[in-house]
């Protein structure tokens, strides 16, 4: 079991020309809210199909009224996260739909009117228990920036929230037959189940059915904080009579922690809890770790919790860059051969092949002439994925089965008459024309534009075209 969490960072006009008009006006003030729908797997289902993993609706955002003449800014957002609880294992791959809705607050008949402003959808891989993944999606002229993560509800852990964990009994190893929950965590896989209702935050068990409390908590289920109400101050030497601490000067006075770090006292000195992106004794050093959620587009962050730790982003298909921030135009590498059409589906590349070619990259040339015969002495010619017959003289058609009519194309010019002949065609020219196709006029004085006709033929006689 666990929770999918979605944090909307901004919703406003995207970059580039054609900024959208503000969805709210002085006459119709409005506010935004968001809906998220989750489905398992990398399905390309319709928006209307059931949200099998769950759905959630945000609270309504602050009321917004457009300032006349001002371009549409980033619109005010609702507070808090959208949380989608899941009861079973986290599937690892999922599809999401995030809808931005506008609630108009003008004098609407029958209460407020709702309209869908934008809908974005995507398919991602995401391991539960990882850091926030950041994303930017565009819908028309609008741009939505958001982060998301899946976290397990204790005591479940692991990338699918299917394993149970408990603190290690010894710092270096787990008990017999128990694996570490994760190499970078000091916890062991726990097949045992604590007493029903035992607080997952403040209780633990060494044996099945028990509930032992962490320091500061008490009660049968470790849900009752140890009372310190009679103590005025949590600092200074202990008073023997009350068991309470008496004030004294503390190492956190004046807050030695830089960059917004918070100070807490330790028996010997102080400790700074640093905000994201800072580390060091006094939070004086800046650095990025997986806790800062540096990986975009569903990239998986790998790295230790220590601020000195490196991190790398394991990118899903279609993204690259040290933070998976760049979308790869994988079709620009022209992976499809033989004129195939490249389709980048995000999770995979597809090649749509031209006729006569096949294979994942259209690399296989199908033998168009295999098993095909051209009749009447024709020869088969491959080309462009379709077979073609080059026919012997006097034959035509796809397979050279048709006897060709050489006169069908009216080859004799200037009214000459065409006669089919075993070796081709013969043109009988009209008076005044000569040539194999009657293409040359005979000059009025009887001289031809061509050399003299061969012996035995006079101008006007049928000319055989061989």
């Amino acid at each position: 079991a666990g929770v999918f969490e979605l944090q909307i960072h901004s919703f406003g006009p995207g970059p580039g020309p054609g900024a959208p008009r503000s969805p709210c006006s002085a006459r119709l003030p409005c506010r935004l809210f968001f809906r998220v729908c989750l489905k398992p797997g990398l399905s390309e289902e319709a928006a209307e199909s059931p949200c099998a993993l769950g759905a959630a609706l945000s609270a309504r955002g602050p009321v917004y009224t457009e300032q006349p003449g001002a371009p549409a800014p980033d619109l005010p957002l609702p507070d808090g996260l959208l949380q989608v609880p899941f009861r079973d294992a986290w599937p690892g791959t999922f599809s999401f739909i995030i809808e931005t809705w506008r609630e108009e607050l003008g004098d609407q008949i029958g209460g407020p009117a709702w309209s869908l402003l934008a809908r974005v959808a995507g398919r991602r891989r995401l391991a539960a228990g990882g850091p926030w993944a950041r994303d930017i999606q565009r819908a028309g002229a609008w741009e939505l920036r958001f982060s998301y993560r899946a976290r397990c509800e204790p005591p479940a852990v692991g990338t699918a929230c299917t394993r149970l964990c408990r603190p290690r009994s010894a710092p270096s190893r787990c008990g017999p037959g128990l694996r570490p929950c994760a190499p970078l965590e000091d916890e062991c896989e726990a097949p045992l189940v604590c007493r029903a209702g035992c607080s997952p935050e403040h209780g633990f068990c060494e044996q099945p059915g028990e509930c032992r409390c962490l320091e500061g908590w008490t009660g049968p289920l470790c849900t009752v904080p140890v009372s310190t109400s009679s103590c005025l101050s949590p600092r200074g030497p202990s008073s023997a009579t009350t068991g309470c601490l008496v004030p004294g000067p503390g190492p956190c006075d004046g807050n030695p922690c830089a960059n917004g770090g918070s100070c807490s006292e330790t028996p010997r000195s102080f400790e700074c809890t640093c905000p994201r992106g800072f580390y060091g004794l006094r939070c004086e050093v800046s650095g990025v770790t997986c806790a800062d959620g540096p990986c975009f587009n569903g990239g998986l962050c790998v790295g230790g919790a220590d601020p000195d730790s490196a991190y790398i982003c394991h990118c899903p298909p279609g993204f690259q860059g040290s933070n998976c921030e760049k979308r790869v135009d994988r079709c620009s590498l022209q992976p499809c051969r033989n004129g195939g059409l490249c389709l980048d589906l995000g999770h995979a590349l597809r090649c749509r092949c031209r006729a006569g070619f096949a294979g994942p990259r259209c690399e296989h040339d199908l033998d168009d002439c295999a098993g095909r015969a051209c009749a009447n002495g024709g020869t088969c010619v491959e080309g462009g994925g379709a077979h073609r017959c080059s026919c012997a003289l006097g034959f035509g058609g796809r397979d050279c089965r048709e006897r060709a009519d050489p006169c069908a194309a009216r080859p004799c010019a200037h009214g000459g008459r065409c006669y089919a002949h075993f070796s081709g065609l013969v043109c009988a020219c009209a008076p005044g024309y000569m040539g194999a196709r009657c293409e040359f006029p005979v000059h009025p004085d009887g001289a031809s534009a061509l050399p003299a006709a061969p012996p035995g033929l006079r101008p006007g006689d049928p000319q055989r075209y061989l």
Epitope: A127, P183, V302, I312, C313, H314, C315, F319, G321, S322
Partner: nanobody, 115 residues
Framework: EVQLVESGGGEVQPGGSLRLSCGPS????????VGWVRQAPGKQRNLVAG???????NYAQSVKGRFTISRDNAKNTLYLQMSSLRAEDTAVYYC?????????WGQGTLVTVKP
């Protein structure tokens, strides 16, 4: 279960160099993110250097300029060249690989830096 095997650890003086190797292993392929994780006594495991599945490299602040990670996809092997070693580099170094579904670890090789 396929496992990663590290080699090249040992004892070295401050300022010295070592080259760690991991593999060959069918796990170390270009579609996986790989790296070197170290754990000093009493400390958390941390990623010292890594190469992502899209070829980006990153290093822990404390080793930048001194350590170099590389992979040979043809040999299915991962390397870590360590130079200008310091006492604080003393740790068990683990080879690590992962994709979206799985992560893989070696048994670790001990690097000790002492005068």
């Amino acid at each position: 279960e396929v496992q990663l095997v590290e080699s090249g650890g040992g004892e070295v003086q401050p300022g010295g160099s070592l080259r760690l190797s991991c593999g060959p292993s069918e796990i170390i392929t270009s579609d996986k993110s790989v790296g070197w994780v170290r754990q000093a006594p009493g400390k958390q495991r941390n990623l010292v250097a890594g190469i992502s599945n899209v070829g980006s490299t990153n290093y822990a602040q404390s080793v930048k300029g001194r350590f170099t990670i590389s992979r040979d996809n043809a040999k299915n092997t991962l390397y870590l060249q360590m130079s200008s070693l310091r006492a604080e580099d003393t740790a068990v170094y683990y080879c690590y690989a992962r994709d979206f579904e799985n992560e893989y670890w070696g048994q670790g090789t001990l690097v000790t830096v002492k005068p």
